[in-house]
Every structure is written in structure tokens, then in C-alpha cells.
């Protein structure tokens, strides 16, 4: 006998919950794979930079975005066959999994505080690398969706150490319509802005890590009331 | 060895056309954006236009916007001018060169190729 | 009248050091673009001699070296020989202009 009234509502809500987060998390996949496997991308690893090889921060980025879907798709898919099975089980390993990924949110939550100049500094060393290969390589699609990304969502441009060929490249095709790269050495530099988001606005990335934490606590709270639920429904 | 050959040039009525071509070997050319310099004579050197790896990206010099078009032939390891409304002032030595991205530069060029816009 | 300025002509005698300035502005050397330096032999092609601001391209002599500070480039031409009467030009970047630029060129002439 399946569980009933209100502890039915939460099922569904888990399952629905659940089953867009296992979505997200394969679009996150999807991309992360279509940008580590692209061949445009792939030549970025032979890349040389003047006479120095190019440092793989882009890539460190993308193994970053891989792993964080395929956890998103896994812990996704408990919350989600555990709520419509009324799987205690599954609904355990879920609950395990939540507790885990809080801890380590939390952990690299203080982490990311104490080292973020360090992490800006690999973010503009991704962004760099991904505009340099959006340049080197002008058939790398992936390449210039990240470096698009990065204007649109930072609403900038460029960056004062550009090259002469790439101040031209992103002159003519690459910058957001408003943003003015020729303006008196790039007021719109993505890598001021990326200093900014990380000193200035450090409290929008808390705001957003706060969303997931109290997202997590309450999936935590609906998969324990569910399994009691299921738990007590068995019972009669 | 790398190597750049330029031909098309010639004496050109004003208003006229001519195609450069630039022949290359002894580098990868489809992975190379490449450009064109010239210089009139007796005069200094003044870059043309400059072309991406795969024709994505490309500009001009405001004294030819408009009436030059650049393109390549990557099977055939080729570069192309095409000028249009020739001008007097349009008189010089044309030259085709490779430019580098690692040295953010013209490193490699061919021996140039005379065009003369005169009636 | 060339975005980046040269003199028109340089000379000096076997053996002794010439320098060859090149002054921008605040939109291309000034901005931190690179110059590079090419040099053209009489009725020849130019041939990059010197880029980066002071990097030579492998097969150019040590004799050859180049400096930057500010809005200017130089370059510099020690144990000056006879091979080296050429015209040099200075190239940088003018991100107001959105244009490669040079300078005029300088010819310069080795003397006796």
C-alpha cells in the first residue's frame, strides 16, 4: 500500500524537485563533456602561448563542471526513483548523499573565502585561455560560448593585457552590444570585473550558496518525512 | 622552410580591378591567420587587411574598407586580395604576410607584387 | 604623417652603436602593445628583426636588441656593419585607430 494525503504531496514534490535537478545536472554534464571533447577545445592542450605553453586552467574548469553535473545527475536520480518507488533505501542513500554534499559545501564554502584571490585568479586565466582559443581557433564554437557567457553575464570586455590581433577580434565580433572595448583602456575589463565579483560582490556568491544550502535542508527534511512516512504506511 | 609568392599585380586603370593571390608552403596555412601590407613607392609600410584561420574573422584599414575583400583557399594553401575602385593612391607594393599569434606579429612575408593604378 | 614617429635617417661608421627610436602614444605603445621591429634591405621584402619589444627571432645576431619605456621604442645597433644599411621600421598596435601601425622607416646609412 503506497503512502497517502500529505505525505503523497511531498512524494510529488520530491519527485518533481528531484527530477529538474537531474535534468540541470545533465544539461551541466552535456555541456561540460561537449566542451572537453569538442576537437576545437582539444587543441588548447597543444596551445602555446608567445614561446610558453599555454597552462591548463580551462581545462581544470571543465573537469570542474563535469563532476558537479554527474553528482547533480546521480543525487538527482535517488530523490527522484526513490520518491515515485517509495524506496527507503534509495531515499537513504539520498538523505546520505545530501549530508555529504552540505558538508562539502560548507567546507568549500570557507575554503573559496579564504583563497579567493587565488580562485579569481584561475577564473581570468579561464576566461583568457578560452578567448585565446576563440581566437587561435576561429571554429571553436565552445571556446566563444564561454567567452560569450562572460561578457553577457559580466557585462564586459576584453582585458588590458590583450593581444593587437585579439583587441581586433573582439572589436569586430565578440563584444556585447554597449560595451565599448576602444573606450580609454577597456573601462569594461573582464578582468576588473572578476576582481570585483569576488572582493565587492564576494556577498552575491554567499547569497547564492545560502539558496542551495536551504535547498538542501529542506530535501533533506521532505526525504526523512517521506521515508517515515513510507516506514509507517508499511507498518499498517 | 616557409614561404609566401605573390602574383596578380599590373598596371590597373583608376576605377578598375585586380586580384592578388598568395601562394604558401612549409607551414600549416589553414591554421594561420595571414594579412596584407603594402607600401607605396618610396614610402612607408601600411598594413591592408588581416583574415582568420577559417575566414570567421577579418578586417580592413579605413582607406580600403569597402572596396577590398580579402579571402583564402585553404586546400589550395592560398591567400586572396580582391580590389575594387582602384585609386591612384592604391599604387604599391603589396605584400602578403603570415601573422603570428604567439608573437602578435608579421613574421614571415613574401617578396611582394606591384600593383599601379595610372591612366 | 605616420601614427608612430621615426627619423627619417640614422647613420654611423663599422664597428660603432646606432639607436633608432620610435615614439607612440597612450593608444598603441603607451597602451601596452608590443613593438616589433622590421628591417628591409634594399629592394627586398621586410623581415621581422626584432618583436615582442625585445625578442629576436632566431638567426638575428645579438648585435640587434630592442627596449621599450613608455610611449617609446628603441633599437639598438652595436658593431654596426656594412650589411646593415637597410631601412627599419617600428610596428605596433592602435587601439583607437583599430589598425596595425608603423613608423615611417628609417634609413639607415653605414658610413666609409
Known amino acids: 500500500m503506497g503512502v497517502e494525503g500529505c505525505t503523497k504531496c511531498i512524494k510529488y514534490l520530491l519527485f518533481v524537485f528531484n527530477f529538474v535537478f537531474w535534468l540541470a545536472g545533465g544539461v551541466i554534464l552535456g555541456v561540460a563533456l561537449w566542451l572537453r571533447h569538442d576537437p576545437q577545445t582539444t587543441n588548447l592542450l597543444y596551445l602555446e602561448l608567445g614561446d610558453k605553453p599555454a597552462p591548463n586552467t580551462f581545462y581544470v574548469g571543465i573537469y570542474i563542471l563535469i563532476a558537479v553535473g554527474a553528482v547533480m545527475m546521480f543525487v538527482g536520480f535517488l530523490g527522484c526513483y526513490g520518491a515515485i518507488q517509495e524506496s527507503q533505501c534509495l531515499l537513504g542513500t539520498f538523505f546520505t548523499c545530501l549530508v555529504i554534499l552540505f558538508a562539502c559545501e560548507v567546507a568549500a564554502g570557507i575554503w573559496g573565502f579564504v583563497n579567493k584571490d587565488q580562485i579569481a585568479k584561475d577564473v581570468k586565466q579561464f576566461y583568457d585561455q578560452a578567448l585565446q582559443q576563440a581566437v587561435v581557433d576561429d571554429d571553436a564554437n565552445n571556446a566563444k560560448a564561454v567567452v560569450k557567457t562572460f561578457h553577457e553575464t559580466l557585462d564586459c570586455c576584453g582585458s588590458s593585457t590583450l593581444t593587437a590581433l585579439t583587441t581586433s577580434v573582439l572589436k569586430n565580433n565578440a563584444c556585447p552590444s554597449g560595451s565599448n572595448i576602444i573606450s580609454n583602456l577597456f573601462k569594461e575589463d573582464c578582468h576588473q570585473k572578476i576582481d570585483d565579483l569576488f572582493s565587492g560582490k564576494l556577498y552575491l556568491i554567499g547569497i547564492a550558496a545560502i539558496v542551495v544550502a536551504v535547498i538542501m535542508i529542506f530535501e533533506m527534511i521532505l526525504s526523512m518525512v517521506l521515508c517515515c512516512g513510507i516506514r509507517n504506511s508499511s507498518v499498517y | 622552410e616557409v614561404q609566401l609568392l605573390e602574383s596578380g599585380g599590373g598596371l590597373v586603370q583608376p576605377g578598375g580591378s585586380l586580384r592578388l593571390s598568395c601562394a604558401t608552403s612549409?607551414?600549416?596555412?589553414?591554421?594561420?591567420?595571414m594579412s596584407w601590407v603594402r607600401q607605396a613607392p618610396g614610402k612607408g609600410l601600411e598594413w591592408v587587411s588581416y583574415?582568420?584561420?577559417?575566414?570567421?574573422?577579418?578586417d580592413y584599414a579605413d582607406s580600403v574598407k569597402g572596396r577590398f575583400s580579402i579571402s583564402r583557399d585553404n586546400s589550395k594553401n592560398t591567400l586572396y586580395l580582391q580590389m575594387n575602385s582602384l585609386r591612384a593612391e592604391d599604387t604599391a607594393v603589396y605584400y602578403c604576410?603570415?601573422?603570428?599569434?604567439?608573437?602578435?606579429?608579421?613574421?614571415?612575408w613574401g617578396q611582394g607584387t606591384l600593383v599601379t593604378v595610372s591612366s | 604623417q605616420s601614427v608612430l614617429t621615426q627619423p627619417s635617417s640614422a647613420s654611423g661608421t663599422p664597428g660603432q652603436r646606432v639607436t633608432i627610436s620610435c615614439t607612440g602614444s597612450?593608444?598603441?605603445?603607451?597602451?601596452?602593445?608590443?613593438t616589433h621591429w622590421y628591417q628591409q634591405l634594399p629592394g627586398t621584402a621586410p623581415k621581422l628583426l626584432i618583436y615582442?619589444?625585445?625578442n629576436r627571432p632566431s638567426g638575428v645576431p645579438d648585435r640587434f636588441s630592442g627596449s621599450k619605456s613608455g610611449t617609446s621604442a628603441s633599437l639598438a645597433i652595436s658593431g654596426l656593419r656594412s650589411e646593415d644599411e637597410a631601412d627599419y621600421y617600428c610596428?605596433?598596435?592602435?587601439?583607437?585607430?583599430?589598425?596595425?601601425?608603423f613608423g615611417g622607416g628609417t634609413k639607415l646609412t653605414v658610413l666609409g
Open positions: 615582442g619589444n625585445s
Open positions: 583574415i582568420s584561420s577559417s575566414s570567421t574573422y577579418s
Open positions: 604576410a603570415r601573422y603570428s599569434y604567439g608573437r602578435d606579429n608579421f613574421d614571415y
Open positions: 610596428q605596433s598596435y592602435d587601439t583607437n585607430l583599430s589598425v596595425w601601425v
Open positions: 612549409g607551414f600549416p596555412f589553414s591554421s594561420n591567420y
Open positions: 597612450t593608444s598603441n605603445i603607451g597602451a601596452g602593445y608590443a
